[in-house]
């Protein structure tokens, strides 16, 4: 029978080296055997390139295309082929469909003043446009209590978050993960980083740090502690903040 596309390709770029397109066929398809996605930059002298898709599910195909360091003016012509049959043709502008790379190396360290210091790495080199554009969302959740989770927006430059231990349940195991987006590019969210887990015990905190530390905040309740955070804490349900771009 004839080959048909059910959901046409939706593409995103990490705006540095790779664009990924995904589409759904109308029936289970061996993507790599039956289909090819050709792509060509709309620029004088650009050659035609071919991407061999892989299966994500029975009828879902995905193609990862190496691109040069993207610039705003870049527009790609995309053609989806089944042999000699052109199934779909369209264009794709990476700068208009950005999905940032996933932040890396999320770690948690004990810090002064009864705080945890969460740190991660910006996934872009300093010379890339997106390096200075990223803001982050950090999700902190109790491993044993699905109701106990917090979401923090990190809108300042440094990839760090200071978290008061007193805002978390003592003795509980917590996991954190982080994702990024680029507001000026109207990007979608990156994938979540792998989670990192730690035990929130802060009595006796001095032993955990290896030496006694005077705590000028001892008399403050958790509201007072929140005032000195470098992140704005937002508690919400994540499904309100899913972005779907096509």
């Amino acid at each position: 029978g004839s080959v048909k596309v059910l959901h046409e390709p939706s593409c995103f770029s990490d705006y540095i080296s790779t664009s990924v397109c995904q589409w759904k066929m109308d029936h289970p398809t061996n993507c790599s055997a039956e289909l090819r996605l050709s792509y060509q930059l709309d620029f004088m002298g650009s050659e035609n390139h071919t991407c061999v898709p892989e299966n994500r599910e029975d009828s879902v195909c995905v193609c990862s295309m190496p691109i040069d360091d993207a610039v705003e003016a870049d527009v790609y012509q995309l053609d989806l082929w089944a042999g000699q049959q052109l199934l779909w043709s369209g264009s794709f502008q990476p700068s208009k469909h950005v999905k940032p790379r996933t932040p890396g190396n999320l770690t948690v360290h004990p810090n002064i003043s009864h705080t945890w210091l969460l740190m991660w790495t910006n996934p872009y080199p300093t010379e890339n446009h997106l390096h200075s554009e990223l803001t982050y969302m950090v999700n902190v959740s109790n491993d044993n209590d699905p109701e106990d989770f917090k979401v923090y927006n990190v809108t300042y430059m440094g990839p760090t978050l200071r978290l008061a231990a007193s805002t978390l349940k003592s003795g509980a195991s917590y996991s954190a993960r982080v994702r990024a987006w680029a507001q000026t590019y109207n990007s979608t969210w990156s994938d979540w980083s792998p989670s990192t887990t730690w035990l929130n015990y802060y009595e006796p905190w001095e032993q955990h740090l290896g030496k006694p530390i005077p705590n000028p905040l001892l008399g403050l309740d958790s509201t007072g502690l929140n005032d000195i955070f470098e992140a704005q804490k937002i508690e919400w349900h994540e499904h309100h903040h899913h972005h779907h771009h096509h």
Epitope: L41, F43, M44, G45, S46, E47, N48, D68
Partner: antibody, heavy 125, light 112 residues
């Protein structure tokens, strides 16, 4: 040393045909787009045509579209310009030149960085 | 098509002085930051053209630093400092951004 040597220029009657060749050496020919530029006697430079490194993409000036065909043989490191239905206004020195690097996704541009010595095409009855 | 306009069409300069040639395009040649697809070429009498400047300001291999290119978007300038007798010839600007590639009319530089 990077070098381009054109040949094939001649005196031809209007409506006639001619094929110019340009043999390249000293660089990886298949990686670069190649261009033809012409110069009528006492006039300025006029771009004629360009072909990508693989030969998959070609471009032409309106004045020659449908009459001239650019091609290349990467195995022989040779660029060609097939000229049909020649007119008096096609009289010029024809230069081949090395253009942009096209093996990358976005071609890397260095201008027309090497030119041949040129070959004279005269169209006259 | 992008139209390239050079001024002046001829120029007479004494040795050691600075020569400036202007080139204006009918459309912006800026593709991305730092990438203006504008070249300068010199054709000496009886010779093939040779590349001087590409991408607006980058000197081609072997070109002395007396030659410099500047400008962005639609307005560009070639400056030749400490002009020498050997600099005589016709200077052309060319846009390499889109087909058809187009040249300026040429500027004839004469050394007094």
């Amino acid at each position: 040393e990077v070098q381009l040597v054109e040949s094939g220029g001649d005196l031809v009657k209007p409506g006639g045909s001619l094929r110019l060749s340009c043999v390249a050496s000293g660089f990886t020919f298949r990686d670069y787009a190649m261009t033809w530029v012409r110069q009528a006697p006492g006039k300025g430079l006029q771009w004629v045509s360009m072909i990508s490194g693989s030969g998959g993409k070609t471009y032409y000036a309106d004045a020659v579209k449908g009459r001239f065909t650019i091609s290349r043989d990467n195995a022989k490191n040779t660029l060609y310009l097939q000229m049909n239905s020649l007119r008096a206004e096609d009289t010029a020195v024809y230069y081949c030149a090395v253009d942009r690097l096209t093996k990358t996704i976005r071609p890397q541009y260095y201008g027309l960085w090497v030119w041949g010595q040129g070959t004279l095409v005269t169209v006259s009855s | 098509d992008i139209v390239m306009t050079q001024t002046p069409l001829s120029l007479s300069v004494s040795p050691g002085e600075t020569a400036s040639i202007s080139c204006r395009s009918s459309q912006s040649l800026l593709y991305s930051i730092g990438y203006n697809y504008l070249d300068w070429y010199l054709q000496k009498p009886g010779q093939s053209p040779q590349g001087l400047i590409y991408l607006g300001s980058k000197r081609a291999s072997g070109v002395p630093d007396r030659f410099s290119g500047s400008g962005s978007g639609t307005d560009f300038t070639l400056r030749i400092s400490r002009v020498e007798a050997n600099d005589t010839g016709v200077y052309y600007c060319m846009q390499g951004l889109q087909s058809p590639l187009t040249f300026g009319q040429g500027t004839k530089l004469e050394i007094k």
